[in-house]
């Protein structure tokens, strides 16, 4: 029973984690304009892995995609790669783990096969979680470096009275979503690996021993006994994370100039 619970919980936790990784990857708020010195701003900048956006005080939001591949910083490309690898591994892991679940019967699949699949999916979840955590951490490190660099050159003089105030960026919501999601996927993977140990059949065959009782002969032959673990009835694995990332393709979100009541 405990093994099934551990496996089921590991699956659910990983599912939530991977949903979170997908959401974080799609989110636009990987870095947001630092408002420390100016909490109320007319133009609020924020950036994601795929596009950068501006929310105006007027209420309009406009996003612009990174339409170049070669012109992007290598670090950003690396973060994208890590997040995509994390998603792909996690998705494969989920697929494998569905068939590995003890509560799901598929033909005459041996417990040993289920144990192997559980271990495989567990490792995949662990690597997926690590990829997400690594990706988010690399981006966070990049932000910290840039933050202090732009603080040092907060005002780059352009001669006379003209000055360019550099926009400083700080951690966006996607980073925290990514860290938590990566952590959950990692935990789910560890739980799957633990469940695998319990699923692996222990072949403890005892030699047959004959007992001769007076009067009649009874042969007691214990052997090949497998401990049967009951399986949980809860097969509804709800996807709880609703990654509020906007994935629409439109670049601008404006009301029409004459939107009547």
């Amino acid at each position: 029973m405990a093994v099934t619970a551990c496996q089921g919980l590991g699956f659910v936790v990983s599912l939530i984690g991977i949903a979170g990784i997908i959401a974080a990857t799609c989110m636009d708020q990987w870095s947001t304009q630092d408002l420390y010195n100016n909490p109320v701003t007319a133009v609020f900048n924020y950036q994601g892995l795929w596009r950068s956006c501006v929310r105006e005080s007027s209420g309009f939001t406009e996003c612009r995609g990174y339409f170049t591949l070669l012109g992007l910083p290598a670090m950003l490309q690396a973060v994208r790669a890590l997040m995509i690898v994390g998603i792909v591994l996690g998705a494969i892991g989920l697929l494998v783990s569905i068939f590995a679940l003890k509560c799901i019967r598929i033909g005459s699949m041996e417990d040993s096969a289920k144990a192997n699949m559980t271990l495989t999916s567990g490792i995949m979840f662990i690597v997926s979680g690590l990829c997400a955590i690594a990706g988010v951490s690399v981006f966070a490190n990049m932000l910290v470096t840039n933050f202090w660099m732009s603080t040092a050159n907060m005002y780059t003089g352009m001669g006379g009275m003209v000055q360019t105030v550099q926009t400083r960026y700080t951690f966006g919501a996607a980073l925290f979503v990514g860290w938590v999601a990566g952590g959950l996927t990692l935990i789910g993977g560890v739980m799957m690996c633990i469940a695998c140990r319990g699923l692996a059949p222990e072949e403890t065959n005892y030699k047959a021993v004959s007992y001769h009782a007076s009067g009649h002969s009874v042969a007691y032959k214990p052997g090949g006994f497998k401990a049967s673990t009951g399986f949980g009835s809860n097969t509804k694995n709800k996807k709880i994370y609703d990654g509020g990332a906007r994935t629409e393709d439109e670049v601008q979100s404006y009301p029409s100039k004459h939107d009547y009541v």
Epitope: Q33, N38, V40, T41, A42, V43, F44, N45, Y46, Q47, S52, C53, V54, E56, S57, S58, G59, F60, E62, C63, R64, V162, Q163, T164, V165, T167, Y254, P255, K257, H258, D259, Y260, V261
Partner: antibody, heavy 118, light 113 residues
Framework: QVQLVQSGAEVKKPGASVKVSCKAS????????VNWVRQAPGQGLEWIGM????????RLNQQFKDKATLTVDKSTSTAYMELSSLRSEDTAVYYC???????????WGQGTLVTVSS | DIVMTQSPDSLAVSLGERATINCLSS????????????LTWYQQKPGQPPKLLIY???TRDSGVPDRFTGSGSGVDFTLTISSLQAEDVAVYYC?????????FGQGTKLEIK
């Protein structure tokens, strides 16, 4: 079509208060910020502040923080600006304007002349 | 606060000729998120409220004739009227829409020579 109609001209004594109204029509009032701008006779434009009709959130130019109070009445789609402790320097035409994309003001009221004179 | 400085203060141009008004900002008006410049141009005729001509430094508002062109980026902006018409006589203002408080240039008075 979009229209912003302001209240009529006012003549006030120094130290008094005045409330200028701006009635909006032809668009969804609660979707757009309403700005207030003043123009002293023969002078340029000066931004006072703006108010969002949906939550009455305001952004005020620090220069006017003790002078202007911005409010809205959603039921009548009207924005108000109250000017207190009037002085002769407050004599100006006061405009309301809707905020469009790019933080630009696309539709303007006809203006309200406030004259402060003893 | 961002200071907007227009030049010249007044300008006299012949009908059909090109008119150019400059606007210099004390700070960059370029938003990194969408690479747009938050600079707006208005036209004000005597006894009338200002009229929006151009926003985002170069985007013409609906109904604005295409003889009006906005250009520039960062701190330096220009409004160009390619062929001056009699109805273009007015005062022109530039406005910072990048940061609070929104500020206007002192205005440029355009007249016919």
């Amino acid at each position: 079509q979009v229209q912003l109609v302001q209240s009529g001209a006012e003549v006030k004594k120094p130290g008094a208060s005045v409330k200028v109204s701006c009635k909006a029509s032809g668009y969804s009032f609660t979707n757009y910020w309403v700005n207030w701008v003043r123009q002293a006779p023969g002078q340029g434009l000066e931004w006072i502040g703006m108010v969002h009709p949906s939550g009455s959130e305001t952004r005020l130019n620090q220069q006017f923080k003790d002078k202007a109070t911005l409010t809205v009445d959603k039921s009548t789609s009207t924005a108000y600006m109250e000017l207190s402790s009037l002085r002769s320097e407050d004599t100006a035409v006061y405009y309301c304007a809707r905020v469009w994309s790019g933080n630009a003001f696309d539709y303007w009221g006809q203006g309200t002349l406030v004259t402060v004179s003893s | 606060d961002i200071v907007m400085t227009q030049s010249p203060d007044s300008l006299a141009v012949s009908l059909g000729e090109r008119a150019t008004i400059n606007c210099l900002s004390s700070q960059s008006l370029l938003a990194s998120g969408n690479q747009r410049n938050y600079l707006t141009w208005y036209q004000q005729k005597p006894g009338q409220p200002p009229k929006l001509l151009i926003y985002w430094a170069s985007t013409r508002d609906s109904g604005v004739p295409d003889r009006f062109t906005g250009s520039g980026s960062g701190v330096d902006f220009t409004l160009t009227i390619s062929s001056l018409q009699a109805e273009d006589v007015a005062v022109y203002y530039c406005q910072n829409g990048f940061s609070f408080p929104f500020t206007f240039g002192q205005g440029t008075k355009l007249e016919i020579k």
